[in-house]
């Protein structure tokens, strides 16, 4: 094609996580993938700094093709500001990574005391659970419904009916996952929602309770039941 | 039914390397984290190391950092521990262990399924 | 790390009789969310350990009622109420709230 263009981003959505937290000896990959007419060249700095091979032990890998930036076996030395400079002669565009290497024992995901909150609010209004997850790992985090289905909570396998409300995902940020928003509530709403995150050390999850209160003048709603999920 | 195989055991002399594996079969491998565990002959057992469930993150213990590799092939359910410059001390079996999965659990969070395990001898 | 510490070394119990294993740990192994992540495994000779209790004192699945798990923070009981013949090999205690994860240096149960 003739038409020039300067760099843009092609698929942001691999650009979300800015902050990475990585133990120590592991691999760590940083991604930019960009367009641009000319294709545009990608360079990589390290606080602000040209970023050489021979600044670190065993050097890194750029896969152009994949606009990736590749370290291997991570050590605190590693720790800082990675920022990829995507450029042509019609423009350059730049994104910032933050590198932690975590050297401390991996525990099992700390969920803040209190959160999720017990809440209650009217039909019709809105509602919000938080949940603050702290993990020296990257956690996986999902916010879980216990619902019923024909008046009972349980299956016939003794499993409780749950259903997989929010889940962290490619498309997902930490701090959107971190909030289950539920807007005008209904009866059915009301229940037990749980948080949980897992790292490969374990799962931990608090739960919390939504009252629904029937709203001014207005009669209580007739809801079909859930379906299963387990 | 769930069930961990390890492979790969043997005899090897001191320096030289050998990678053990373990087929999981039963249960939904991608969505699980994966530990090696040791144990000595004659002695207790001991954690080497664990993979996240996609294999993004992976801790080990200090007796085998830098020498151990814990990696795992989703696709194919199978678990693996490339073991370099191996030490006479590194002589045991070795058990392949179901760790936490990725959901809500009603039981243990893992440690609750692990293989029959695998010889490794290490000696001159 | 989390040193784990079992007493005794060996125990020889009559069948039908109860026994009693204590293991301590050198930190609190109760987690924010309130559950204490101490398990206890059986291996009996020639097999790998096989789960009997997790979260200090939840029984898995198929495991005999005989077995009961109990402690808080830092210091753990198993108890069995009647040992059986099948209750020979090796107890061990675990803490599962953070990497390395480690395990008492076990309690070898034999029968009188």
């Known amino acids: 094609s003739n038409n020039k263009r300067a760099p843009y981003w092609t698929n942001t959505e691999k650009m979300e996580k800015r902050l990475h937290a990585v133990p120590a000896a592991n691999t760590v990959k940083f991604r930019c993938p960009a367009g641009g007419n000319p294709m545009p060249t990608m360079r990589w700095l390290k606080n602000g700094k040209e970023f050489k091979q021979e600044h670190r032990i065993g050097g890194y890998k750029v896969r152009n093709q994949h606009w990736s930036l590749i370290m291997e076996s991570v050590v605190p030395s590693d720790k800082g500001n990675y920022t990829c400079v995507v450029e042509n002669e019609y423009g350059s565009i730049n994104h910032t990574y933050h590198l932690d290497v975590v050297e401390r024992s991996p525990h099992r995901p700390i969920l803040q005391a209190g959160l999720p909150a017990n809440a209650s609010t009217v039909v019709g209004g809105d509602v919000e659970f938080v949940c603050k997850v702290y993990s020296d790992a990257q956690p996986h985090i999902q916010w879980i419904k216990h619902v019923e289905k024909n008046g009972s909570k349980y299956g016939p396998d003794g499993l409780p009916y749950l259903k997989v409300l929010k889940a962290a995902g490619v498309n997902t940020t930490d701090k959107e996952i971190e909030v289950l928003y539920i807007r005008n509530v209904t009866f059915e709403d009301a229940g037990e929602y749980t948080c949980l995150a897992g790292n490969s050390i374990g799962i931990s999850f608090h739960s919390a309770w939504l009252t629904v209160l029937p709203a001014p003048g207005r009669e209580k709603e007739i809801t079909a039941s859930p379906d299963y999920l387990e | 039914e769930v069930q961990l195989l390890e492979s790969g055991g043997g005899v090897v002399q001191p320096g030289r390397s050998l990678r053990l594996s373990c087929a999981a079969s039963?249960?939904?491998?991608?969505?699980?984290?994966m530990h090696w565990v040791r144990q000595a002959p004659g002695k207790g057992l001991e954690w080497v190391a664990v993979i996240s469930y996609d294999g993004s993150n992976k801790y080990y213990a200090d007796s085998v950092k830098g020498r151990f590799t814990i990696s795992r092939d989703n696709s194919k359910n199978t678990l693996s521990l490339q073991m370099n410059s191996l030490r006479v001390e590194d002589t045991a079996i070795y058990y392949c262990?179901?760790?936490?999965?990725?959901?809500?659990?009603?039981?243990?969070?893992?440690?609750?399924?692990w293989g029959q395990g695998t010889m490794v001898t290490v000696s001159s | 790390d989390i040193v784990m510490t079992q007493t005794p070394l060996s125990l020889s119990v009559t069948p039908g009789q109860p026994a009693s294993i204590s293991c301590k740990s050198s930190q609190s192994l109760l987690h924010s969310d309130g559950k204490t992540y101490l398990y206890w495994y059986l291996q009996k000779p020639g097999q790998p350990p096989q789960l009997l209790i997790y979260e200090l004192s939840n029984r898995f699945s198929g495991v005999p009622d005989r077995f009961s798990g109990s402690g808080s923070g830092t210091d753990f009981t198993l108890k069995i109420s009647r040992v059986e013949a099948e209750d020979v090999g090796v107890y061990y205690c675990m803490q599962y709230i953070e990497a390395p994860l480690t395990f008492g240096g076990g309690t070898k149960v034999e029968i009188k």
């Open positions: 262990v179901r760790g936490a999965g990725r959901g809500y659990t009603y039981g243990p969070d893992g440690f609750d399924i």
């Open positions: 039963g249960f939904t491998f991608s969505s699980y984290a």
